[in-house]
Amino acid sequence: LQEKIEEIAAKYKHLVVKKCCYDGVRINHDETCEQRAARISVGPRCVKAFTECCVVASQLRANNSHKDLQLGR
């Protein structure tokens, strides 16, 4: 997960945009990525970075959980 997020974040050269990506990775079981992104007011660049990283992180976590279930963990 960390490697993949670092790979995505590396393309954002504006520090705030990069941090928006990292914010998207934080675990929040109560809201979807879309719901969380809707509260961002600093600009579309932040929304885009946040959403991309949030979705990728959610997918990777879901895949890992699925693998764990398959392995009977």
Epitope: K11, L15, V16, V42, G43, P44, R45
Partner: antibody, heavy 118, light 111 residues
């Protein structure tokens, strides 16, 4: 309407520090990044750094080698730029500006003249 | 850091004529289809004023005689026709990455 109002002109001795303020009004202060630029007499614009007041995130131009510190007071909607170890080459007009959509500077302060002289 | 090189450094134009200023970036200021190049006008004793953002979008209240174009590393600001009040310094600026950088400026004088 959106306004950025800066503090008044300063005259400083070499080696001292200066702190310039930039009071924002007419919009939600925490929604936009505040940048600081400077312009030496007859010269172009030089970017110094910025702060995102909502999170306190900052980034600085490495040319200033740790001499610049940008802070923000959310309670008064004011951003500050402090420059230390002043030298004569720091004589310039210092501007704050709001960055809209993480793309462009749509509103600027009126500028603060800082003169460094012994 | 992205270096922005403006040319010419100064320009004298007759009223009614066209003024063209170019800005060349040391690397692309495009990102995922968007251009992060902006243009500002600065008159003596005043702060810079936004003219054009994202390469070609006119800020509100800016006369239509100002236009911007370009992509990647090469950008142009055009004033057509030039008017007397356009006497000023013009700066390009990129915001695709930190540190934000400005071009060296172009001084436009009206003959």
């Amino acid at each position: 309407q959106v306004q950025l109002v800066q503090s008044g002109a300063e005259v400083k001795k070499p080696g001292s520090s200066v702190k310039v303020s930039c009071k924002a009004s007419g919009y939600t202060f925490t929604d936009h990044i505040i940048h600081w630029m400077r312009q030496a007499p007859g010269q172009g614009l030089e970017w110094m750094g910025y702060i995102y007041p909502r999170e306190g995130w900052t980034n600085y131009n490495e040319n200033f080698k740790g001499r610049v510190t940008i802070t923000a007071d959310k309670s008064t909607s004011t951003a500050y730029m402090e420059l230390s170890s002043l030298r004569s080459e720091d004589t310039a007009v210092y501007y704050c500006a709001r960055e809209r959509n993480l793309e462009y500077f749509d509103y600027w302060g009126q500028g603060t003249t800082v003169t460094v002289s012994s | 850091d992205i270096v922005l090189t403006q040319s010419p450094a100064s320009l004298a134009v007759s009223p009614g004529q066209r003024a063209t200023i170019t800005c060349k970036a040391s690397q692309s200021v495009d990102f995922e289809g968007d251009n992060y190049m902006n243009w500002y006008q600065q008159k003596p004793g005043q702060p810079p004023k936004l003219l054009i953002y994202a390469t070609s979008n006119l800020d509100s209240g800016v006369p239509a005689r100002f236009s911007g174009s370009g992509s990647g590393t090469d950008f142009t600001l055009t004033i057509n026709p030039v008017e007397a009040e356009d006497t000023a310094n013009y700066y390009c600026q990129q915001s695709v990455e930190d540190p934000h950088t400005f071009g060296g400026g172009t001084k436009v004088e009206i003959k």
